[in-house]
Every structure is written in C-alpha cells, then in structure tokens.
Amino acid sequence: WPPPGTGDIIVQAPTQVPGFLGDSVTLPCYLQVPGMEETHVSQLTWSRHGESGSMAVFHQTQGPNYSEPKRLEFVAARLGTELRDASLRMFGLRVEDEGNYTCLFVTFPQGSRSVDIWLRVLAKPQNTAEVQKVQLTGKPVPVARCVSTGGRPPAHITWHSDLGGMPNTSQAPGFLSGTVTVTSLWILVPSSQVDGKSVTCKVEHESFEKPQLLTVNLTVYYPPEVSISGYDNNWYLSQNEATLTCDARSNPEPTGYNWSTTMGPLPPFAVAQGAQLLIRPVDKPINTTFICNVTNALGARQAELTVQVKEGPPSEPSGMSSN
C-alpha cells in the first residue's frame, strides 16, 4: 500500500527487558525512519498478549490513556510533538506483569508497525551461609547451609569443596508472591580433619553482575585426639632435664590434661605442667610408660609413650638435654 520504492520504517525495541519486583521499568520502543523517508504517526499503542484491549494508547489529539493510570506513563510522547518514541514506564512491578507486550505505531502512509517485548520480572535474592555445627556421627549430615531468599527466578546454588561431600538443594515459596527461596545443604561424614576447613557456596542469579561467593568455616565437635611428643629414643643418664608434650586436637578445646604412668601416679622425677611433663635428670636407668589423658566437653582420650633412660653418655648431646 505505500508508494512503490518506499524504504521501510522500523520499530526498534529490545526483545527482552528486565525489571525488579516493586520497582519501575521502562519498556523502550522507538520508530526508526530512514533518512529520506517521510512518515506520520497518529497513535501509539501498547497491549499485552493474552489480554483484551490495549493497556496504553497515545492518540494524536486525545493524548495518553491508560488501563491503569497510576502504574503506566508514556516517557517521551507529548501532544504536539512527533510521535516517534513510544517508550512506556511501568511502576510498582508485580509478578503478574511478566509477559509479552506489543508496542505498535499507527503510521501513514506505511501503515501499522509493531514489535514484541518480553518483560521479565526479577527479584534480587538475599543470600546467607552458615555453619551447621556437628559431632562425629559416622554418617552423612549437613555441615553447612546456604540460603538464597526471595529470588525470581530461583537462584542457582553450587558448592566448592576439597573435602568431598554432596549438596542437597530444595526450593520453597518466598515471602513475596512469585519469589522462591532456595536452600542448599552441604552434606558429608564429619571427621576431625574437616573441622576448621572451609567450603564455599556460590550463588548465581540473573540480577547479579557476578556470582556471590559465601565461605563457611566448618565446625565438627570431636573428643581429643592425643599423641605425646618430645622423645627421640636417645635419652641417657646424667643429662639435663627433658620435656614431653601432650599434643591434643579437639573441639571444643581441651579442659584438662592428666599425666600418669601404667604403674599409677607419676614418679618423683616427672613433674606435670599442664600439657607438658618435665623429666628431671635420673641417676639410674628407667623404663616407664607415661600416659597423657586429655579431657574436653565430649569426653576423654589418652596416649601412651614408653620412655627409656639408658646408661652410657652419648657421643653428642641429645635426649635429656633436648630442651
């Protein structure tokens, strides 16, 4: 119907526009008219797929009209101006606003021209990660919890860990209608080696410029793991005093150290000083098994070490002169 040889006019708009729940968003829509082309626009119309009637119209003489006047506004169209910009602002975005919209220009002599725009309603989730404090259960349990609250669409949660384990992720409706809360648990068999180590929860969402990383330091409660150090099998008579140390790893921290021997109480030459046992010089050989008993809130564990103090001076200082 336009005259032969007429270059066509084009409606320009993005195929998809994101907007945030509760915020306002502009649906951009422009009429691009090639250099030598002439066109006259008399009406701008916005309608939504699947709904009867138009939601916004800008008429050359009647001006703007809206199905929801408080929520819609033509950004640039004004009476008495060339109607080339049909951009529409929507206020107070709701979940139900998501959908396909048609922006249409009624022009002469080219006729009607339109374009479809998908409005995506997003909600930016709030993310938290927390440790799930556990004891040695011998079976897989959640040791960390990552929650992405109120996202639309649902956030995507993944875990990064060198400790093994596996995720267990679930979804539930968010506080605001149409939003989703995603909860992900990191599950493994707790061990003392895991305590104090970290795992990272990675949350990805359309609304984020980059993924959010949340690190969780794990807590595993376990009774003491005990060993005794400080003896090198080369202790001799008439040398300086030496020290044995009771090395204990536990969570929570040890509450007490108790030194004894397999024969009962400590001999006179052995003096307990908390986690350390001071061995004073002796004048005759000994062969004693020392016991360190360590207690924490979860229980007590012990370690044994047999110490021999031998005759004959060493060729070079060692053993009891080791401190």
């Epitope: 119309t45 249409l104 009607s112």
Partner: antibody, heavy 116, light 107 residues
Amino acid sequence: EVQLVQSGSELKKPGASVKVSCKTSGYTFTEYTMHWVRQPHGKGLEWIGGIHPNSGGTSYNQRFKGRVTITVDKSTSTAYMELSSLRSEDTAVYYCARWTGDFDYWGQGTLVTVSS
Amino acid sequence: DIQMTQSPSAMSASVGDRVTITCKASQNVGTNVAWYQQKPGQPPKALIYSASYRYSGVPDRFSGSGSGTDFTLTISSLQAEDLAEYFCQQYQSYPYTFGQGTKLEIK
C-alpha cells in the same frame, strides 16, 4: 474549532471525472493526514485513500485501480480528491476526514451523482 | 482485505435499555478499531478509538471493548438521541475497512 468544508454536489456523466475539494480550518493543516471516504446511499462506508499534506505521501485503496488522485494545496489548507472514469456505481456521498488513526473530524459530505 | 462483520444489521430498543453491537474482524487487528455514530443526513462522528477509549465529549454510557478479532460497542442506558447508525472500522492494515453498519431504532 476544527472545520472541514466540502464543495457542493456534482452531477457527472459516465466516463467523466470529478474533483471534490475540502477546505480546512481550526488546526494546523500540515500536521494531520487527510483521507477520503465514500458512502453510497443507504449503504456502508468505503475508504478511498489519504494524503499527508507535509510530505505529499499518499496511500490509496487498490479497488480504485488508479482512478483516484488525492492532492493538497498547503497555501489554502485544502485537500482535493479527483476520481476519473466515473461509472454509475460511483454515485455516493464523498467525505473528507481528518485522520488520527481513526477519523476524528469529517466534512459535511459531497453528493456525486453519475448518470447519463 | 480485512472484512469487518457487524451484527445485528438493525435493532430496536427502548430508552434505558442496555444495547450491545458486535463487530468481528476476518483477521487479527489488535486494538486498532474505531466506532462511529452517524445520524440521518449527517457525517459520521467518532465515538471510540483503539477499541476501548472514548473520545472526549462522548457520553460515558458509550463503551468499547475487545481485541484481536472480536469487538463490542455497548450503550449502557439508551437515550432517545442515540437513534443512529453505528459503524466499526479497522485501521490495522490497508485498505481501512468499515463494518456494514447497525441501524438502531428507538421503540
């Protein structure tokens, strides 16, 4: 006040041409497209075509197969519609109408009678 | 061409009645539909544009609705001065086409 005043009735013989005028006032002539619509007696409305006074761009109903020419005189804010090779079925009231997508103002109409 | 089929072609109603006139397009015209009122011996007068928006000065008893292919003009409470013929028109694509009209008489 927007006004569209058309020329008077015409009686034409088959094969002749007719040129109807539409003088406008009360608005900026070059800002609105002007169209022509006809209505045979007791019948419906039929769109003939239109013109944008500023650019001279036109669009015609193909049914009229090159028999119609729409022009404007910007200096007098007047639009014209010329229909040639008239036949009896062209007998109708011819209206000029200002276009805003729909037609918001109409002339009073010009009766064109084609009869031998 | 897009055909606009109006119904009924004629009807009579009493003052105060609710009157509904329908118009069906032969293909999707979006909301690019106008309604006109034409009283005897006069040119048509625009009532509704873009399917559902009333022209300023048009009484609010006139309302339009619809999109796609099915459109309705409703007069909520008929008045004596509404005696006229009513036409729908699509302006989605060339050639612009009108319905054949609905003649409304007052009982």
